[in-house]
């Protein structure tokens, strides 16, 4: 799903070859064409590993290969977040980490990857065919989610290879925003080029681009948007899903966690601008005016009321007590 297409060596015409007006109209197409060719969709990878030491203990690692700043990561099991999945952990880059049993330990590994260790015993322990999903909310792409599970015959200590986004899913924030502009730009570009073709023009230095230059990938965002809106989720065997989790706030974490709807990844404008969102039916999308988007799905049975989030004015270090110490 990652589409970092190589930009063909396009050569804009030399300024002296056309009048000022003509030059200006030709600059935009080159810019747009570059955008069209390089436009890509982010990719999320998920790796699930059963620990050799504790046979029912799992490590889930997830990473985001997009270009934006991550504003929230949600790890769930039993299906995608908001589509029947149960939230295991939520990681916020400035407010710390919140986790629910049987999650034992969620951590950032790098700025764009996280890991989660799951407890191996008890009624809510995972089993080999459990599906784990990671959802990354980022600015400006929106939310991207991928799911993975252990291969059926996994040996302990072995891991499933990282799975790049088996569930194609991107929220309208990224798709309709960026992709819409790019799609419009690309169409406009074609229109300009076609118009330019039919108009007698001075001879331009031919571009060195081969006719086989990678064009197909330029349309990835619009393909993604169509797929995201039409591809149904995979049916997931949920025989190992836990009972509803009633340990919603085991560490008495700060109030913002209590008010964080665990079904949705809210994308803040900046590090501290949060918003709560109404919750329509599963699979629908909510767009909020000033660039705040949230993928909306059904509220899992264990979540509290969807209250508005207020950032802690003291910043992340104020969170240490409840979040850091177990």
């Amino acid at each position: 799903m990652r589409t970092e297409a190589q930009v063909p060596a396009l050569q804009p015409p030399e300024p002296g070859l056309e009048g000022a007006m003509g030059h200006r109209t030709l600059v935009l197409p080159w810019v747009l064409l570059t955008l069209c060719v390089t436009a890509g969709t982010p990719e999320v990878w998920v790796q699930v590993r059963m620990e050799a030491t504790e046979l029912s203990s799992f490590t889930i690692r997830c990473g985001f290969l997009g270009s934006g700043s991550i504003s929230l990561v949600t790890v769930s099991w039993g299906g995608p977040n908001g589509a029947g999945g149960t939230t295991l952990a939520v990681l916020h880059p400035e407010r710390g980490i919140r986790q629910w049993a049987p999650a034992r330990q969620a951590r950032w590994e790098t700025q764009s990857s996280i890991s989660l260790i799951l407890e191996g015993s008890g009624a809510s322990s995972p089993c080999a065919n459990t599906t784990f999903c990671c959802k990354f909310a980022s600015f400006p792409e929106g939310s991207w989610e991928a799911c993975g599970s252990l291969p059926p015959s996994s040996d302990p200590g072995l891991s499933a290879p990282p799975t790049p986004a088996p569930i194609l899913r991107a929220d309208l924030a990224g798709i309709l925003g960026v992709s819409g502009v790019l799609l419009f730009g690309c169409v406009y570009l074609l229109h300009l080029l076609r118009r330019h073709k039919h108009r007698p023009a001075p001879r331009l230095q031919p571009s060195r681009t081969s006719p086989q230059a990678p064009r197909a990938r330029a349309w990835a965002p619009s393909q993604a948007s169509q797929a995201a809106l039409h591809v149904p989720y995979a049916t997931i065997n949920t025989s190992c899903r836990p009972a509803t989790l009633d340990t919603a706030h085991p560490h008495g974490g700060p109030s913002w966690w209590a008010s964080l709807p665990t079904h949705a990844a809210h994308r803040p404008q900046g590090p501290a601008a949060w918003a709560s969102t109404p919750i329509p039916a599963r699979g629908s999308f909510v767009s909020v005016e000033n660039g705040l988007y949230a993928q909306a799905g059904e509220r899992p049975p264990h979540t509290g009321p969807g209250l508005t989030l207020f950032p802690d004015p003291r910043g992340p270090r104020a969170m240490e007590g409840p979040l850091g110490v177990r």
Epitope: L65, Q111, E320
Partner: antibody
């Protein structure tokens, strides 16, 4: 209050080994990765590696493989950096820094000065 | 490993000046770049993460930008207390690497 308290300055002879400590307070080291960094006088920072206190797994910059050994004792909330076969090139300030609750080094130790001299 | 080339090495400026430091990665690191400030005799302190996000409590005269391989860090109006060494760092892939540092001195 979150703190990373590092052991005191060390003066050791070439060829010897040394073990530096980083005592964490205000949080559980199982919740983070402990990273170690090296800074030579008037030079940049070099990443030595990181240890996962949960399982003792460690990862190193290839330049420090064989030179450094990272360990952690979760019962006492202490991370360790052991350096072996010391030479004058190892003279530097060594820092521990935590990463994991947030996706960046939000807390650093005060640094331990290691001087290797005969 | 990814090499982070930071320029310039030294900056001698007057209070009130604007300064810009650049960091170039040897390969794309997306936005996984952090900027630190290290004052004399102290440990480094985080200023910017994700290439452009100002850390809590960091004055807004400090800004970062960039994506891929080219990153910049600016101080819009230098103040006397900004005397320090500034480092960029990538954590896109292991081993994590730092720029060589820029020593900012005030005239």
């Amino acid at each position: 209050e979150v703190q990373l308290q590092q052991s005191g300055a060390e003066l050791v002879k070439p060829g010897a080994s040394v073990k530096l400590s980083c005592t964490a307070s205000g949080f559980n080291i199982k919740d983070i990765y402990m990273h170690w960094l090296k800074q030579r006088p008037e030079q940049g920072l070099e990443w030595i590696g990181r240890v996962d206190p949960t399982n003792g797994n460690s990862e190193y910059d290839p330049r420090f493989q064989g030179k450094a050994t990272l360990t952690a004792d979760t019962s006492s909330n202490i991370a360790y950096l052991q350096l072996s076969s010391l030479t004058s090139e190892d003279t530097a300030v060594y820092y521990c820094a935590r990463f994991g609750i947030y996706p960046y080094f939000d807390y650093w130790g005060q640094g331990t000065t290691l001087t290797v001299s005969s | 490993s990814i090499v982070m080339t930071q320029t310039p090495k030294f900056l001698l400026v007057s209070a009130g000046d604007r300064v810009t430091i650049t960091c170039k990665a040897s390969q794309s690191v997306n936005k996984a770049v952090v900027w630190y400030q290290q004052k004399p005799g102290q440990s480094p302190k985080l200023l910017i993460n994700y290439a452009s996000n100002r850390y809590t409590g960091v004055p807004d005269r400090f800004t970062g930008s960039g994506y891929g391989t080219d990153f910049t860090f600016s101080i819009s109006t230098v103040q006397a207390e900004d005397l320090a060494v500034y480092f960029c760092q990538q954590d896109y892939s292991s081993p994590w690497t730092f720029g060589g540092g820029t020593k900012l001195e005030i005239k």
